[in-house]
């Protein structure tokens, strides 16, 4: 028998520095977790103690903090090289800055293979990107070889900016021939490493013949055997065992997100490459694990540029950006309109001639807006200003909801109107009329939404049974501010870009902004 230790991360999302327990900015260092310096300590400890170790990443290193905003992926290549990752799969967020934003900072700089079997380049890009990412890689580990085959969510064109010269194929269809190829090369230990979410990970384990282990990402799935060490609730045991169609027991793993845990899986293979046993657990990277001093020193060196960046001008406003609670928790506010417009703009994807865009709607809890911006400061808007407006370090996510769920959400928005509570919704691509003289739960008298399957966008009444795409804060997708109906009834949820980054990118692109209050939210009494 031959034993392999797989160490794995996924959805790190730019958390190079240690974070608080909820993966936001570290406030009390003695209680902080994760970060590459701490991760390196644990990885090195395991490398010294065990003979056959692979360190793998299942994608979405890009996007999530000011580190990515400033360094644009160079930080990912640098620190992953320093940690000596053995392989990485491409995630959807690796395409957030377009293909060029992937090629230059990461693909050309990484000293480890970057993988995806179901992304096929065409046209002029094919030669430019050739060899920079691979469908699979055979890695020598001790006296053996292990095949790693990569995959990426086929929804990436809707979630990021891969352009028109990359085709995202069905994962299972694309993986099978690559695994077959590995088998013909006498590679009998094969790991599928990818970024399509836990449901697809399980399908790959079930359907792709020859895959021994699946290491996934995208769904931020936390698996654990026994008593979990922090606040994440396990979605199942670690590893999650799937019985494949040909009768094998295939371990599937994922390690939550944000570098909070290091996935730790021990696999025992027989001489024919069959998995005899698998066991392990994610390791919580808490403050009992010291940060590696040399990596920490490097982090501190790279940090300097971030501090300078936060006070630089991103763009200008020629109007007062009203982010006051008096406005945003009671009525339409132009700060809410600005943020929603930025959220929609960040999700412009012309992927189908029938649609001007795949999503037109935004909702945003007024309580998530935390500061106005005064235009009398020469109109200057900085990252620092935006961090006061959006201080909670969230993301703006894409969900699919039925019209009936949206109607419930808008009723919830005003169910206790008048108390300066955070659930009052700011909107984009939506016209809503409330009648506060009616009883709570029956106050939405008009709800029109901007069409997507149209060449000239116009507002049509919301249809209760129709499925709509909506951009919203992850806080709402997780049921925050009492929006339990969103959490309970959402049909799909893909995590998006860092909130401040979305707004800062929009302001930089527009250069000068002047958002208005324009009748997106109205109040009436009496008949309609």
């Amino acid at each position: 028998a031959w034993e392999l230790t797989i160490l794995h991360t996924n959805d790190v999302h730019s958390r190079l520095e240690q974070t608080s327990e909820d993966s936001s900015k570290c406030v009390n260092a003695s209680r902080c977790m994760g970060g590459v310096a701490r991760l390196f300590t644990k990885v090195q400890q395991i490398r010294r103690a065990e003979p056959n170790v692979l360190l793998l990443d299942a994608g979405d290193q890009y996007q999530g903090t000011i580190w990515f905003t400033v360094y644009k992926g160079a930080e990912v290549a640098h620190f992953m090289n320093a940690l000596r990752y053995d392989a990485m799969a491409l995630g959807n967020h690796e395409f957030d800055n377009g293909v060029e934003g992937l090629i230059e900072p990461l693909l050309k700089e990484a000293k480890f293979p970057i993988l995806s079997a179901n992304i096929k380049a065409k046209g002029p890009l094919a030669s430019q990107i050739s060899g920079l990412y691979l469908p699979y890689k055979v890695l020598p580990v001790g006296d053996e070889v292990v095949g790693i085959v990569g995959y990426t969510s086929k929804e990436t064109p809707f979630l990021s900016n891969p352009g028109t010269n990359l085709v995202f194929e069905d994962e299972i269809t694309a993986l099978q021939p690559e695994v077959d190829k590995l088998k013909t090369l006498n590679v009998n230990k094969i790991i599928a490493l990818g970024h399509s979410g836990f449901e697809m990970d399980k399908l790959i384990a079930q359907k792709v013949r020859g895959v021994d282990v699946v290491v996934g990402g995208h769904s931020n799935t936390f698996l654990y055997t026994g008593n979990p060490p922090s606040k994440e609730v396990p979605a199942g045991k670690y590893p999650f065992i799937v019985t494949s169609d040909d009768g094998r027991k295939v371990p599937v793993v994922q390690a939550y997100a944000f570098g909070k845990y290091l996935g730790y899986l021990k696999i025992e293979f027989d001489e024919r490459g069959n998995v005899i046993s698998s066991h392990g657990n994610p390791i919580l990277l808490n403050s009992s694990i010291p940060e590696d001093p040399s990596i920490k020193a490097d982090i501190n060196k790279w940090r300097i540029k971030l501090d300078n960046y936060s006070t630089q001008e991103l763009g200008k406003t020629i109007v007062y950006l009203d982010g006051s609670s008096q406005s945003c928790r009671f009525r339409e506010c132009n700060m809410g309109n600005l943020i929603c417009d930025a959220m929609i703009n960040n999700n412009l994807r012309h992927t189908d001639e029938m649609f001007w865009n795949h999503v037109s709607m935004c909702i945003l809890n007024g309580g998530g807006i935390r500061s106005p911006i005064d235009e009398r400061n020469n109109g200057t808007i900085t990252w620092e200003n935006l961090a006061a407006v959006l201080p909670f370090g969230g993301t703006f996510d894409l969900v699919q909801l039925k019209g009936s769920t949206l109607k419930k959400a808008f009723e919830h928005s005003v169910h206790r109107y008048g108390q300066s509570t955070g659930e009052f919704l700011q909107v984009g691509g939506i016209h809503v009329v409330y009648d506060l003289s009616r009883k709570p739960g029956d106050r939405v008298v008009k709800l029109d939404v901007l069409c997507t399957k149209c060449r000239v966008p116009s507002y049509d009444p919301l249809k209760m049974d129709e499925v709509y795409k909506v951009i919203l804060p992850n806080f709402l997708a997780n049921g925050g501010d009492g929006f339990q109906m969103i959490k309970d009834e959402l049909l799909r949820h893909d995590s998006g870009d860092q909130d401040i980054n979305v707004v800062s990118t929009y302001i930089s692109k527009m250069k000068v902004i002047y958002p208005a209050v324009e009748g997106r939210i109205k109040f009436s009494t009496g008949s309609h």
Epitope: S20, S324, S325, S371, A387, A388, P391, F392, S420, G480
Partner: antibody, heavy 117, light 106 residues
């Protein structure tokens, strides 16, 4: 490290006034709604007042309405509670606290106000 | 104002016991409920918010449930450091605390 430090407590006669201060550090004070909560000796917690992050909304418990005024100075990271027409039943430890927000909540260690002749 | 009634007002238990404290609101408050722990001479500490969401750094032996008017705080296996006073607080309207439940060693 997040810190909230209350000050200004002390002994005051019935009908008198006192101004409590709360100095905040370690977080973006101007982005948080802030509360005052009190606890009479040997008794439970009683919410007193709240002020929104930028100061435009204020709410008070019925027991203090018209007598107490909450205010803040975001440039100084400071929260205040002006207490007038004090009564014996206002004797308590007064805590300032952030709202329960996306990053949890924080409380100071309290300052004791004693109203007695 | 919405009133909060906690029960029991005090209870004795042993290390390792499972303990349940209940809180009833005088009218529906959806899930706008928090639970706090307070030790003598100390500020309250948030345990649970939104009725069932565990605050960062709080051990998983604490859990909350309920919606509407009836809520429960459960400590699955009491530890020595859990002996304290527990308060519920509604934030559906202007905040209001329950009268507290004192948990002491049997």
């Amino acid at each position: 490290e997040v810190q909230l430090v209350e000050s200004g407590g002390g002994l005051v006669q019935p009908g008198g006034s006192l101004r409590l201060s709360c100095a905040a550090s370690g977080f973006t004070f101007s982005s948080y709604d802030m509360h005052w909560v009190r606890q009479a000796p040997g008794k439970g917690l009683e919410w007193v007042a709240v002020m929104s992050y930028e100061g435009s909304n204020k709410y008070y418990a019925d027991s203090v309405k018209g007598r107490f005024t909450i205010s803040r100075d975001n440039s100084k990271n400071a929260l205040y509670l002006q207490m007038n027409s004090l009564r014996a039943e206002d004797t308590a430890v007064y805590y300032c606290a952030t709202e329960i927000a996306a990053k949890g909540d924080y409380w100071g260690q309290g300052t004791l106000v004693t109203v007695s002749s | 104002a919405i009133q909060m009634t906690q029960s029991p007002s005090s209870l004795s238990a042993s290390v390792g016991d499972r303990v349940t404290i209940t809180c009833r609101a005088s009218q529906g408050i959806s899930n706008y409920l928090a639970w706090y722990q307070q030790k003598p001479g100390k500020a309250p500490k948030l345990l649970i918010y939104a009725a069932s969401t565990l605050q960062s750094g709080v051990p998983s032996r604490f859990s909350g449930s309920g919606s509407g008017t009836d809520f429960t705080l459960t400590i699955s296996s009491l530890q020595p450091e859990d002996f304290a006073t527990y308060y519920c607080q509604q934030s559906y309207s202007t905040p209001h605390f329950g009268q507290g439940t004192r948990l002491e060693i049997k």
